[in-house]
């Protein structure tokens, strides 16, 4: 099964959980937990590249990220197939490949990805802002169509020759950034623990400060390390989590595909992983929006009152002490 790896955004532990576990809980376990790589659900990707050697030659690559078997792939340009798009190629895993000008070479790259090279000469040649679409008929997921065009920064004169597409390449910077923050947090945590170990035990003497002061001092390192590791939401490579589709709709295509079987098998629909996300019926727009993104499998933009750097119920002043502001 091909899935898109995603690195969930860092988030603070839920207040309820933290309350239940006490204030000693360090953020590190939570951070490590959120860094577990999760598997994605069906998704279609489209990559469009202009050849550096031939300015009017395009390479289109499409892939299906899912567990189903591909029964048909249709590549079109000028928009989706049902909306004014013109079919360039139809690829069937058993019946072969059919292509139309200006398609030069259509081929299967893997069981779930294809590539198409377009000839660029004459009236039928594609232009830089042409939209290319790929429709995957997959069993049992159903029919999935996605489109792509040349990215805004595509300057064929400057671009390197096409290389195999690393799907997560553009997100490496974000991943490295988060790794850096994590590394720094771990080092800082170790430093604090070491300092805490080597510190001489305080002598017991009557204190004129409030009875809460020693506790505030004692837990300051924990609080500080928590604050240090509370990173704002960082959507590294978000993926919605659409549930699987019920029916397959193979593309009608040219007459010689007419005899293709239509799969109408129904996949048992278990409760979706995100179906139980409670969305407030009324309330702040922020909470509604967060609920929606949770429902869509996206990390919500954290703009609401949920993020607190001071999980201690006593508020910011609990940070006072060796590391706090006096």
């Amino acid at each position: 099964m091909r899935t898109e790896a995603q690195v969930p955004a860092l988030q603070p532990p839920e207040p309820g959980l933290e309350g239940a576990m006490g204030h000693r809980t360090l953020v590190l376990p939570w951070v490590l937990l959120t860094l577990c790589v999760t598997a994605g659900t069906p998704e279609v990707w489209v990559q469009v590249r202009m050849e550096a050697t031939e300015l009017s030659s395009f390479t289109i690559r499409c892939g299906f990220l899912g567990s189903g078997s591909i029964s048909l792939v249709t590549v079109s340009w000028g928009g989706p197939n049902g909306a004014g798009g013109t079919t360039l190629a139809v690829l069937h895993p058993e019946r072969g490949i059919r292509q139309w000008a200006p398609a030069r070479q259509a081929r299967w790259e893997t069981q779930s990805s294809i590539s198409l090279i377009l000839e660029g000469s004459g009236a039928s040649s594609p232009c830089a802002n042409t939209t290319f679409c790929c429709k995957f008929a997959s069993f049992p997921e159903g029919s999935w169509e996605a489109c792509g065009s040349l990215p805004p920064s595509s300057d064929p004169g400057l671009s390197a020759p096409p290389t195999p597409a690393p799907i997560l390449r553009a997100d490496l910077a974000g991943i490295l950034g988060v790794s850096g923050v994590l590394l720094f947090g771990c080092v800082y945590l170790l430093h604090l623990l070491r300092r805490h170990k080597h510190r001489p035990a305080p002598r017991l003497q009557p204190s004129r400060t409030s009875p809460q002061a020693p506790r505030a001092r004692a837990w300051a390192p924990s609080q500080a390390s928590q604050a240090a590791l509370h990173v704002p939401y960082a959507t590294i490579n978000t993926s919605c989590r659409p549930a699987t589709l019920d029916t397959a709709h193979p593309h009608g295509g040219p007459s010689w595909w007419a005899s293709l079987p239509t799969h109408a098998a129904h996949r048992p629909q278990g409760p979706a992983a995100w179906a139980s996300t409670p969305i407030p019926a009324r309330g702040s727009f922020v909470s509604v929006e967060n609920g929606l993104y949770a429902q869509a499998g996206e990390r919500p933009p954290h703009t609401g009152p949920g993020l607190t750097l001071f999980p201690d119920p006593r508020g910011p002043r609990a940070m006072e002490g060796p590391l706090g502001v006096r």
Partner: nanobody
Framework: EVQVVESGGGLVQSGGSLRLSCAAS????????MGWFRQAPGKEREFVGR??????????SYADFVKGRFTLYGNQARNTVYLQMNSLKPEDTAVYYC???????????WGTGTLVTVAS
């Protein structure tokens, strides 16, 4: 400031087609994800589909009710996304909202919505 504007909504017969457009303007250079949500009368807003750009690759995902009827496509250079809706059903009647987000959610802009009514 980023503005997101939807258009293309209207009244359509059951089984008909409609194409919604969403254009983001302003500081949109780093727009990373653009998607559609919808809210039917008396219901919660729900996810329809989203398009995500990463270098020269575009990723697209849909909600389960789409079942191959809708196609989401767009042009990152123009910060525009389209939702092509075919085989529309009365239950698709809703206000359709577009959402545009940049990487790390620095920008997170919502449109005011466009009404789609499917008559039976």
């Amino acid at each position: 400031e980023v503005q997101v504007v939807e258009s293309g909504g209207g009244l359509v017969q059951s089984g008909g087609s409609l194409r919604l457009s969403c254009a983001a303007s302003g500081r949109t250079r780093s727009m990373y994800v653009m998607g559609w949500f919808r809210q039917a009368p008396g219901k919660e807003r729900e996810f329809v589909g989203r398009i995500k750009w990463s270098g020269d690759t575009t990723y697209t995902s849909y909600a389960d009710f789409v079942k191959g009827r809708f196609t989401l496509y767009g042009n990152q250079a123009r910060n525009t996304v389209y939702l092509q809706m075919n085989s529309l059903k009365p239950e698709d009647t809703a206000v359709y909202y577009c959402n545009g987000r940049s990487r790390f959610n620095v920008i997170n802009a919502w449109g005011t919505g466009t009404l789609v009514t499917v008559a039976s």
